[in-house]
């Protein structure tokens, strides 16, 4: 069964078959005997019963309103209502492009990665039985596909098959014909992937520093969406509160990954921060990658070759 | 912007009364249904009364009788006339607004206001 029309805002295009179905459709079939009324209002029109006899376009049944087809005067509030349910639509009929195929404000956007699975269907359950031919467009040029019921591609992606797709389906009612159409809008995107996440620079980096000043041990990595990036140093975490793990900055790159940094703040330098480890670690499902800093007097600076420093 | 603001709550004796009001954007006004809800201390929140489309209105059995439901289109505000207040009527007292209402539940895209405190003491 089609199921029932519960966003509050519907946006459609003029010209095309339309419908609205409340959402206590199962419990109107039980209560047959029930009344059932449906009301539009829109700006100094408050609230008219709609019926047969409104408009030779509105066809109501117990679930369903429908506009064969709907027009951009149809704009307005809609409302069902039976014993103690009620249910408001607001619908907004824009005009169609008359020099496309498709309204571009009616368009459903799509990415897919190539080389991966990418699929399009021409379906349209709730008018199914009186469907009498569809087809699909690509950039508005008829794709001529085997099946003219319900064409479908099927294939990996290639950056050639980016475009816009159309499906339209032209069917009959009380002897007019009519067409809906459904458009995507494809995006084919490099290969998203993930990485193995690298922490930039050496491994080890000897940080020259002054007693009583501070220092800001940057660390950089670039890793996937979901991969984390942390500070490890002493015995016990937080227990200097001289140190301080700053918010962690994130850019995404070109190719979809995400350059990450995160500094470690050491205040007021003392002794007991010189000559120990604090490591920098990038996690992943696949596994880690750790740097270490090490702070060293200015003073002892001679005793280690200068290409292992950082500034 | 959709937005419900009550006011009206505050501390009562009980069989006092008490007249909550709730304003809204023409948005939340316009919508399927408004009503009041309350919760009070450690419990879930409970339907107190709604006006549906075309004034129909539903109330919770504890405040039949003695609760009046009542709304004024030119000013967007919805109103709850409590009378005969009861001890178990304490709580916070929300406005709330719906596009799918079913009597007193709210099933579909729902706005809330912040609420309003009432205080009823024997």
């Known amino acids: 069964a089609e199921s029932c029309t519960s966003r509050p805002h519907i946006t459609v295009v003029e010209g095309e078959p339309f419908y609205l179905k409340h959402c206590s459709c199962s419990l109107a079939h039980e209560i047959e005997t029930t009344t059932k009324s449906w009301y539009k209002s829109s700006g100094s029109q408050e609230h008219v019963e709609l019926n047969p006899r409104s408009s030779s376009r509105i066809a109501l049944h117990d679930c369903v309103l429908e506009f064969w087809p709907v027009e951009l005067n149809d704009t307005g509030s809609y409302f069902f209502q039976m014993k103690n349910y009620t249910q408001k639509w607001k619908l907004n009929v824009i005009r169609r492009n008359k020099h496309s195929c498709f309204t571009e404000r009616q368009v459903t956007s799509k990415i897919v990665e190539v080389k991966k699975f990418f699929q399009i269907t021409c379906e349209n359950s709730y008018y199914q039985t009186l469907v009498n031919s569809t087809s699909l467009y690509k950039n508005c040029k008829k794709l001529l596909l085997e099946n003219n019921k319900n064409p479908t591609i099927k294939k990996n992606a290639e950056f050639e098959d980016q475009g816009y797709y159309s499906c339209v389906h032209f069917l009959h009612h009380n002897g007019k014909l009519f067409n809906i159409t459904k458009t995507f809008n494809i995006t084919i995107v490099e290969d998203r992937s993930n990485i193995v996440p690298v922490l930039l620079g050496p491994k080890l980096n000897h940080v020259a520093v002054e007693l009583g000043k501070n220092v800001r041990l940057n660390c950089s990595a670039l890793l996937n969406e979901e991969d984390v990036i942390y500070w490890m140093f002493g015995e016990e975490n937080g227990s200097d509160p001289n140190i301080h793990e700053e918010k962690e900055m994130r850019i995404m790159t070109p190719e979809g990954k995400w350059h990450a940094s995160k500094v470690l703040r050491i205040e007021n330098i003392g002794e007991s921060n010189l000559n120990v480890l604090y490591n920098c670690t990038v996690a992943s499902t696949g596994g880690t990658d750790t740097k270490s800093f090490i702070l060293v007097r200015k003073a002892d600076m001679a005793d280690i070759p200068g290409h292992v420093f950082t500034r | 912007q959709v937005q419900l603001q009550e006011s009206g709550g505050g501390p009562v004796q009980a069989g006092g009364s008490l007249r909550l009001s709730c304003s809204a954007s023409?948005?939340?006004?316009?919508?399927?249904?408004m009503g009041w809800f309350r919760q009070a201390p450690g419990k879930e929140r409970e339907g107190v009364a709604s006006?549906?489309?075309?004034?129909?209105?539903y109330y919770a059995d504890s405040v039949k009788g003695r609760f009046t439901l009542s709304r004024d289109g030119a000013s967007k505000t919805l109103y709850l006339q409590m009378n005969s207040l009861k001890p178990e009527d304490s709580g916070t007292y929300y406005c709330?607004?719906?596009?799918?209402?079913?009597?007193?539940?709210?099933?579909?895209?729902?706005?809330w206001g912040q609420g309003t405190q009432v205080t009823v003491s024997s």
């Open positions: 709330a607004s719906s596009n799918i209402c079913n009597g007193l539940n709210l099933q579909g895209n729902t706005y």
């Open positions: 023409t948005t939340a006004y316009d919508n399927a249904c």
């Open positions: 006006i549906h489309l075309r004034d129909r209105t």
